[in-house]
């Protein structure tokens, strides 16, 4: 009678197992082992019983025993079972990013594995189990169909296979692919709302604001501003799910003409567009030309004002004639123009809107001097003693400079309050000068007596 | 960390008894061919008893066969060497060793009998 | 008198080559049975230092080798150091005496 031990073994592959080969006989002509895997004796003393070290077993394998006996010939088998854990361990590649409301399907595929009888593919949601089936095929496939949510938001979804081999007493074999991470969004259907001025003035800045409501997670969602190719650098401030996203935008000349402003909003793999045009303009303030800015009584001057050439400009409220980007006017310099202001107004039409520019120069006439009666009375009588002002005033472009003498050394104290006196009396010449020239005038101080009674 | 740790040795008198123990850890001793080995003072080593995993099968030396016992309790992780008829030639000092199948691969710290009158 | 026969005693100088043989019979090395090689320091336990004729269990340094020819066996330890001043034995089977047999054992010094 032949025997084996142990009868079953459950073993990793590539493992090694001893196995007893035993007879009931003392003096067996014959015992030993048959088996395709590797095997070696043990040095052992005895005829009756031989043990093999069977070795890299890597698959299911029926070794058996035989031995040859005075009583006849008989054999043993025993059972070896291998184990091992799936080599790969999959879920199908997914985007991360997925809209809430999508039905998303899982994929988990496994290779490998063995006793497939103990294995079991799981698919979880964190630790939540979603399905729960045998492995069978090769690879074998398990899938489930999952609604996503808002609050699946940053779930990990694995897959997982348990080789249990606690009935065998050995332990659950547990092997976790790399987990899926979901990203969920909402992005509305609606563009992104984007508030700028239609119209740019070159070498100038301008705000843009653009947002968009409805989003989740709004601190995921990346918003592009641009203006052409210029990439704007905006702002970005969040509410709960929406956001505003605020830059300003420099223009120079180079971008002059029609320019496509635009708002890209992207979040996962879908985004969001609003296109606008902004009209980039270049209107520089007219320039208003005199002859001469400084002229002197009587001379001609011609006042010139000139703008953009597709400008319409008024002269002092006068509008150019045709109306157009030149306007001019002529007039013979009088003292009353010194100070004058000239001012050009320019309009110009861009993209359907108004836009105005102004320039003033003013003129400086020069005239004088001038002494005459109203300013300057020839005939003063003050009472002695009483508190007089004396006033000459002169006239002229620039300020003359006056000054009074009696006898040509005794002066009158112009401007200034003074108490009548005896010394007072007599005619003073009055002297204005300037760099136009000069003018003189008499003016007589009369001095009365008190009445004694 | 495989140990064995051999006790009961000293001295005893020609035709007297000692039973010596090797207790184990570190390993499954039940699944472990255990044997002793002994040494006389200044010579070589020699092997003396074997018994299998289970003490199904016992094996001796010629020159102890009949005076000695192997034996083993797997419940408690000890192997056993009962020595009966000592004599002086038996003076040595005895190691246990774990046998792998073909080489003695871990051995004890071994314990002196000496055998003297 | 020890079935297998070792040298009594071997020497050597530090870095020098010295080889310890081991002979057996027709019954034991001669029949393929493996040759063993342990080690004993001085004042301690034997300690496998080589098994299945030329293997080293993990921690004996590569100086040591074992090889195996017909009924003979042997055992070069090469870069030799102080540390390997110790007794050396040779161990096999012995299908005749079913039993297991040890060399007498070589007592190497490092001169």
């Known amino acids: 009678q032949t025997s084996v031990s142990p009868s079953k073994v459950i073993l990793p592959r590539g493992g090694s197992v001893l196995v007893t080969c035993s007879t009931s006989c003392d003096q067996p002509k014959l015992l030993g082992i048959e088996t395709p895997l590797p095997k070696k004796e043990l040095l052992l003393p005895g005829n009756n019983r031989k043990v093999y070290e069977l070795s890299n077993v890597q698959e299911d394998s029926q070794p058996m025993c035989y031995s040859n006996c005075p009583d006849g010939q008989s054999t043993a088998k025993t059972f070896l079972t291998v184990y091992w854990t799936p080599e790969r361990v999959e879920l199908a590649p997914l985007p991360s990013w997925q809209p809430v409301g999508k039905n998303l399907t899982l994929r988990c595929q496994v290779e490998g594995g063995a006793p497939r009888a103990n294995l079991t593919v799981v698919l979880l949601r964190g630790e939540k189990e979603l399905k729960r089936e045998p492995a069978v095929g090769e690879p074998a496939e398990v899938t489930t169909t999952v609604l996503v949510r808002r609050d699946h938001h940053g779930a990990n979804f694995s897959c997982r296979t348990e080789l249990d081999l606690r009935p065998q007493g050995l332990e659950l074999f547990e092997n976790t692919s790399a987990p899926y991470q979901l990203q969920t969004f909402v992005l509305p259907a609606t563009p992104p709302q984007l508030v700028s001025p239609r119209v740019l003035e070159v070498d100038t800045q301008g705000t843009v604001v653009c947002s968009l409501d409805g989003l989740f997670p709004v601190s995921e969602a990346q918003v592009h501003l641009a203006l052409g190719d210029q990439r704007l650098n905006p702002t970005v401030t969040y509410g709960n799910d929406s956001f505003s996203a605020k830059a300003s935008v420099s223009v120079t000349a180079e971008d002059e003409g029609t320019q496509r402003l635009t708002c890209a909003v992207i979040l996962g793999n879908q985004s969001q567009e609003t296109l606008q045009t902004v009209t980039i303009y270049s209107f520089p303030a007219p320039n208003v030309i005199l002859t001469k800015p400084e002229v002197s009584e009587g001379t001609e001057v011609t006042v010139k004002c000139e703008a953009h050439p597709r400008a319409k400009v008024t002269l002092n409220g006068v509008p150019a004639q045709p109306l157009g980007p030149r306007a001019q006017l002529l007039l013979k310099a009088t003292p009353e123009d010194n100070g004058r202001s000239f001012s050009c107004s320019a309009t110009l039409e861009v993209a359907g809107q108004l836009i105005h520019k102004n320039q003033t120069r003013e003129l400086r006439v020069l005239y004088g001097p001038r002494l005459d009666e109203r300013d300057c009375p020839g005939n003063w009588t003050w009472p002695e003693n009483s508190q007089q002002t004396p006033m000459c005033q002169a006239w002229g472009n620039p300020l003359p400079e006056l000054k009074c003498l009696k006898d040509g050394t005794f002066p009158l104290p112009i401007g200034e309050s003074v108490t009548v006196t005896r010394d007072l009396e007599g005619t003073y010449l009055c002297r204005a000068r300037s760099t136009q020239g000069e003018v003189t005038r008499k003016v007589t101080v009369n001095v009365l007596s008190p009445r004694y009674e | 960390e495989v140990q064995l740790l051999e006790s009961g040795g000293g001295l005893v008198q020609p035709g007297g008894s000692l039973r010596l123990s090797c207790a184990a850890s570190g390993f499954t001793f039940s699944n472990a061919w255990m044997s002793w080995v002994r040494q006389a003072p200044g010579k070589g080593l020699e092997w003396v008893a074997f018994?299998?995993?289970?003490?199904?099968?016992?094996y001796y030396a010629d020159s102890v066969k009949g005076r000695f016992t192997i034996s083993r309790d797997n419940s408690k992780n000890t192997l056993y060497l009962q020595m009966n008829s000592l004599r002086a030639e038996d003076t040595a000092v005895y190691y246990c060793?774990?046998?792998?199948?073909?080489?003695?691969?871990?051995w004890g710290q071994g314990t002196l009998v000496t055998v003297s009158s | 008198q020890s079935v297998l026969t070792q040298p009594p005693s071997a020497s050597g100088t530090p870095g020098q080559r010295v080889t310890i043989s081991c002979t057996g019979s027709s019954s034991n090395i001669g029949a393929g049975y493996d040759v063993h090689w342990y080690q004993q320091l001085p004042g301690t336990a034997p300690k496998l230092l080589i098994y299945d004729n030329n293997n080293r269990p993990s921690g004996v340094p590569d100086r040591f080798s074992g090889s195996k020819s017909g009924t003979s066996a042997s055992l070069a330890i090469s870069g030799l150091r102080s540390e390997d001043e110790a007794d050396y034995y040779c161990?096999?089977?012995?299908?005749?005496?079913?039993?297991?047999?040890f060399g007498g054992g070589t007592k190497l010094t490092v001169l």
């Open positions: 018994i299998w995993y289970d003490g199904s099968n016992k």
């Open positions: 060793a774990r046998y792998s199948g073909w080489y003695f691969d871990y």
């Open positions: 161990q096999s089977y012995d299908s005749s005496l079913s039993a297991w047999l």
